[in-house]
Amino acid sequence: WELTILHTNDVHSRLEQTSEDSSKCVNASRCMGGVARLFTKVQQIRRAEPNVLLLDAGDQYQGTIWFTVYKGAEVAHFMNALRYDAMALGNHEFDNGVEGLIEPLLKEAKFPILSANIKAKGPLASQISGLYLPYKVLPVGDEVVGIVGYTSKETPFLSNPGTNLVFEDEITALQPEVDKLKTLNVNKIIALGHSGFEMDKLIAQKVRGVDVVVGGHSNTFLYTGNPPSKEVPAGKYPFIVTSDDGRKVPVVQAYAFGKYLGYLKIEFDERGNVISSHGNPILLNSSIPEDPSIKADINKWRIKLDNYSTQELGKTIVYLDGSSQSCRFRECNMGNLICDAMINNNLRHTDEMFWNHVSMCILNGGGIRSPIDERNNGTITWENLAAVLPFGGTFDLVQLKGSTLKKAFEHSVHRYGQSTGEFLQVGGIHVVYDLSRKPGDRVVKLDVLCTKCRVPSYDPLKMDEVYKVILPNFLANGGDGFQMIKDELLRHDSGDQDINVVSTYISKMKVIYPAVEGRIKFS
């Protein structure tokens, strides 16, 4: 019996087609992805093949103005239109709190939404009961397939699930649910979830009875043969893991942002064992037509976005200096504003010992592309912020050793004075440079704000300590020459859309007046 699994993950509100790098589509003839194009390909495959499941491994939420405006209603609407069969909860599905998940998505989705390792307690338990499930048994042709979900247990540090959801260890939570499916005579089981490729492989190895793992969170690109675009494969598709009980378990993921549609064909024997598996992600490039009816619907929903872009988010009573002349040479108040917003967006008081789990922010000055003039009645709009942060990036959470941070700050000024983008703006960090010293030895003082303290204060950076830092995904990926970050980071979790972070902060503060306050000094 053959099953075709079509899968997406980490779509991050890319409802419209995007450029090749998943930013805003500029030249339509070169654009990719989007739900209208995805629908065309899904329909084609459904038409051709008998037993097809369309699955999503989480993080539909967060990433473009679509989510900012529609807050998840767009996800439910267009996933319903594409007739998804199941979805796993990702960490970003909790970005607007549990209510922001329940109302727009859980109550509106016409497909099951799954996670076996999230347990509700207190008053939430009855409110959310039945709105998401640990597993679902789906009829496919003449057979049944069990889908069991899972979500990163780091979600409380990455999003806003509140205090009434407990995120358990994935493997511990999955095993009893898979066992239950086996007792229900379901012998074909897919684990669908959002914990990253390493955890996907562990689930394949450790959870008895799981036949296939469809994952997300780590934006992993797997491919067999010559890859069709810029993404470099982390391994073959599917990636085969030998389980502890000796089975060959295919593990798949389909990069991110709706650029590819994962396509996996599995052949099962009559006892539900995987006999063979093959496939590849399908690049959704512009040679695949956008479905006209879905496209028309997208255009209808778009109207509200255009109106939103020009509405006031808040006010500034000071000039927001985002000029290259400032942000690439010294501390600039636009850099301070953005870093303060980044920290504010990551406030998660999850432990009595810590006032917060993260206190530090770094931001490449070259990523700040425009100032905002306060003389326009102080008004700040989404449109203004899009000029400051035009690249459609995210502000991510990483874990780094102190020694890596020290290297990063040396790199920040290794060729100072040439208006290059690697000069770092900061939050929760005090740095002093001596430019008379040779490159690689210019950081004379580097103090960082404590987290394990009731009264935050600045202490000298410890080389061997592991620190959490918020930074642009551009830096996490080694951009602007920060190869040491990419090479030495110990953990990397994708965060929220950059403009969304700053706009939320400005809306919350209502009136802002960031200052230049001595975060960066030269001796």
Epitope: L283, S286, S287
Partner: antibody, heavy 121, light 107 residues
């Protein structure tokens, strides 16, 4: 290399049936769709229907529903098109053409050489 | 069924000429349009798929454009081997339909 080899010319009487074959080689037969297109002498092209050999799923042009049957034998990588209740206006060249539904070439990328079917009393 | 109206139905041109053939769909077909070349007694050959993508091995003088309902095939510098009949086809909805053809003849 990809090849679609069709069966030879047929002469049929009105009311009879004809079965045209299309043998595929050079690719995985079950991973592509096969369409049948006909062309009457001096006329344009007319799509009759398609079969997906991997699943056996068929889709027919309403115009031929009830008269056309498309099948595939995956063990010998051959597709068949049977047209019944033949009439003189069915006299045409019948082509099989491949369709890459997993790829991105929206069109028929390989065609058979055609089979001439003549319906005459 | 979606109607594909092709024009002109025939056209006389000389080698070296730039030739444009148009095709109009009776409803929005996105970019799901292909163009074929057919010579007498031969099967059609795919030239352009998805409205603007040149099929492998097709000379660069052939180009396609359009989306929605209006499509164009352009031959930038006509060669002697290009005299043939050209068909557009929509691949958006079944029944897949072809234009009536454009016969390109030597002037």
């Amino acid at each position: 290399q990809v090849q679609l080899v069709q069966s030879g010319a047929e002469v049929k009487k009105p009311g009879a049936s004809v079965k045209v074959s299309c043998k595929a080689s050079g690719y995985t037969f079950t991973s592509y769709g096969l369409s049948w297109v006909r062309q009457a002498t001096g006329q344009g092209l007319e799509w009759m229907g398609e079969i997906y050999p991997g699943s056996g799923n068929t889709y027919y042009n309403e115009k031929f529903k009830g008269r056309v049957t498309m099948t595939a034998n995956t063990s010998i990588s051959t597709a068949y098109m049977e047209l019944s209740s033949l009439r003189s206006e069915d006299t045409a060249v019948y082509y099989c053409a491949r369709y890459d539904y997993l790829g991105s070439s929206y069109g028929f990328d390989y065609w058979g050489a055609g089979t001439t079917v003549t319906v005459s009393s | 069924a979606i109607r594909m109206t092709q024009s002109p139905s025939s056209f006389s041109a000389s080698t070296g000429d730039r030739v444009t053939i148009t095709c109009k769909a009776s409803q929005d077909v996105s970019t799901a349009v292909a163009w074929y070349q057919q010579k007498p007694g031969k099967a059609p050959k795919l030239l352009i798929y998805s409205a603007s993508y040149r099929y492998s091995g097709v000379p660069s003088r052939f180009s396609g454009s359009g989306s929605g309902t209006d499509f164009t095939l352009t031959i930038s510098c006509l060669q002697s081997e290009d005299f043939a009949t050209y068909y557009c086809q929509q691949h958006y909805n079944t029944p897949y339909t072809f234009g009536g053809g454009t016969k390109l003849e030597i002037k």
